[in-house]
Interface confidence: low
């Protein structure tokens, strides 16, 4: 294992990293630790403000966590010759607020990308597709981890954060091979309806710890490979028949629904009936009512139709969406 801990150069970011001198095979960037045997480079918690230009060509696993990168420009990892082996790239917690189009171009083996815990005020629609063509070359990405990338309210663009993320996921249909997508803890109020249709290979989708109120306009129908759907810790009030039928029709899926504020009124009857007979929901015996007050903490599986009535004087704003 080789490592370098000398002070990094303060030279400005190269306009095109591809024009940099090719690194020596055993070179390790300043402020990084390198292991050729493990094909791993770690530049962790070093307050780096740019991606090192002199990454060794052998790198398969690159950790750039806990830095101050701020912006990932186009071609941030483009090198000549390219980093052809790089398979896993972790950029979590590096204070990124902008990921530009083509930031991950010229990484032909990149299978896993983690951008979690970065307050992304701007995520280019072409961050993952690399081009603005209506159909782009397929991305090699198989796992995309975007947990807690929501910026603080004062840094948000005018457009919806959900829409910005969705645009990046569907651009150019580049992510058709994506198997895993984590979008936990992003304050999502809704899931744009066209996103999942463009991700037909998904096996694992994590939408936990968001603020999703309804899945009425979300279609899971084409996610025939979906195996895990995490919807814990949202604001879901009820799942309607269309959603229930779609989930039941997915051959391999396991759905996680814990810690949602289920409203146990007459609109809940179909969901309760479905819960009693489905094997799709994991831990379904833990699901409890949150509203109305008289039903609080009742177990959904123990309810019958007589329990599920709608109070005629309940204001419409408190009824289910």
């Amino acid at each position: 294992t080789s490592s370098a801990s000398s002070s990094s150069s303060s030279a400005p970011f190269l306009a095109s990293a591809a024009s940099a001198q090719p690194p020596l095979p055993d070179q390790c960037p300043a402020l990084c630790e390198c292991s050729e045997a493990a094909r791993t480079v770690k530049c962790v918690n070093r307050n780096l403000t740019e991606v090192p230009t002199d990454l060794p060509l052998y790198v398969r696993n690159l950790f750039l966590t806990g830095n101050q990168l701020a912006v990932l420009p186009a071609g941030a990892f483009a090198r000549r010759p390219p980093l052809a082996e790089l398979a896993a790239l972790n950029l979590s917690g590096s204070r990124l607020d902008e990921v530009r189009g083509g930031a991950f171009e010229h990484l032909p083996s990149l299978r896993q990308l983690d951008l979690s815990h970065n307050p992304l005020a701007y995520l280019s629609p072409f961050a993952f597709s690399g081009s603005n063509a209506s159909i782009s070359a397929p991305s090699p990405l198989v796992e995309l981890i975007l947990n807690h990338i929501v910026p603080p309210d004062d840094k948000r663009q005018n457009r919806s954060f959900e829409g910005m993320v969705a645009a990046a996921l569907v651009a150019g249909r580049a992510l058709q091979g994506l198997h895993l997508l984590e979008l936990a803890s992003n304050h999502f109020l809704y899931l744009p309806r066209d996103v999942l249709a463009q991700l037909p290979s998904l096996r694992y989708l994590d939408l936990s710890n968001n603020s999703l109120v309804s899945l009425t306009y979300v279609s899971f129908r084409n996610l025939t490979h979906l195996e895990s759907l995490h919807l814990e810790d949202n604001a879901l009030k009820v799942l309607h028949n269309g959603t229930l039928a779609e989930l039941q029709g997915l051959p391999h899926v396991r759905v996680f629904l814990d810690n949602n504020p289920w409203v146990c009124d007459c609109h809940m009857a179909d969901m309760v009936t479905w819960l009693k007979q489905t094997g799709v929901v994991q831990g379904k015996d833990r699901l409890t009512c949150a509203f109305p007050e008289k039903m609080r903490n009742r177990v959904l599986l123990e309810l019958n139709s007589a329990d599920l009535d709608c109070d005629p004087i309940l204001p419409p704003s408190l009824q289910t969406s």
């Epitope: 950790f63 398979a87 896993a88 796992e143 198997h179 895993l180 694992y204 195996e227 895990s228 995490h230």
Partner: antibody
Framework: EVQLLESGGGLVQPGGSLRLSCAAS????????MSWVRQAPGKCLEWVSA????????YYADSVKGRFTISRDNSKNTLYLQMNSLRAEDTAVYYC??????????????WGQGTLVTVSS | DIQMTQSPSSLSASVGDRVTITCRAS??????LNWYQQKPGKAPKLLIY???SLQSGVPSRFSGSGSGTDFTLTISSLQPEDFATYYC?????????FGCGTRLEIK
């Protein structure tokens, strides 16, 4: 240097329980999915269970589902396999292995040396 | 579950021979196929990942090919240390099954 060291194996009666541990070092443990693979004497490798880097997702072979529980403590860099309702056919050497590149695009690039579990009365 | 079938189950060969081992999946698994070598009393060792990529430190006489359902591990010129059991493994499915191995013996 990446190292995986299993422990906790031994002789147990049918219906009994055992907890295996795998101590990991030399890498950022929480960034990698991990797995247990077993091999009965003179038999093939059998994938048993896996767990994501965060511990949030777990996966089990049908032969152990409901009896075995995989877990991890990222603060201790340790992987566990809790084995309940053990049967004679669970007798095997149990290996822990590191997944490289996530779960759905994975390969096991480092393995421990294994710990022997014998289920017999 | 996806079943993996290896053939032959055992094979006798001589030093210097070219050897081919095949692995067939019960459904398409794209290129999510890995090959491991195991010697008696030892843990398995990764040789090939993603069907054709050679793991660091593995001699170049080992190569892998295939996509979909049919895969091949080739040893271009057998060396004495190559006599072992070889396993394929798919990581396409929810459960990551192994083939039952091909035992490579000295003729």
């Amino acid at each position: 240097e990446v190292q995986l060291l299993e422990s906790g194996g031994g002789l147990v009666q049918p219906g009994g329980s055992l907890r295996l541990s795998c101590a990991a070092s030399g890498f950022t443990f929480s960034s990698y999915a991990m797995s247990w693979v077993r091999q009965a004497p003179g038999k093939c490798l059998e994938w048993v269970s896996a767990i994501s880097g965060s511990g949030g997702s777990t996966y089990y072979a049908d032969s152990v589902k409901g009896r075995f529980t995989i877990s991890r403590d990222n603060s201790k860099n340790t992987l566990y396999l809790q084995m309940n309702s053990l049967r004679a056919e669970d007798t095997a050497v149990y290996y822990c292995a590191r997944y490289y590149g996530g779960y759905y695009s994975a390969w096991m690039d480092y393995w421990g040396q294994g710990t022997l579990v014998t289920v017999s009365s | 579950d996806i079943q993996m079938t290896q053939s032959p189950s055992s094979l006798s060969a001589s030093v210097g021979d070219r050897v081919t081992i095949t692995c067939r999946a019960s459904q398409s698994i794209s290129s999510y196929l890995n090959w491991y070598q195991q010697k008696p009393g030892k843990a398995p060792k990764l040789l090939i990942y993603a069907a054709s990529s050679l793991q660091s430190g593995v001699p170049s006489r080992f190569s892998g090919s295939g996509s979909g359902t049919d895969f091949t591990l080739t040893i271009s010129s057998l060396q004495p240390e190559d006599f072992a059991t070889y396993y394929c493994q798919q990581t396409y499915g929810y459960l990551h099954t192994f083939g039952c191995g091909t035992r490579l013996e000295i003729k």
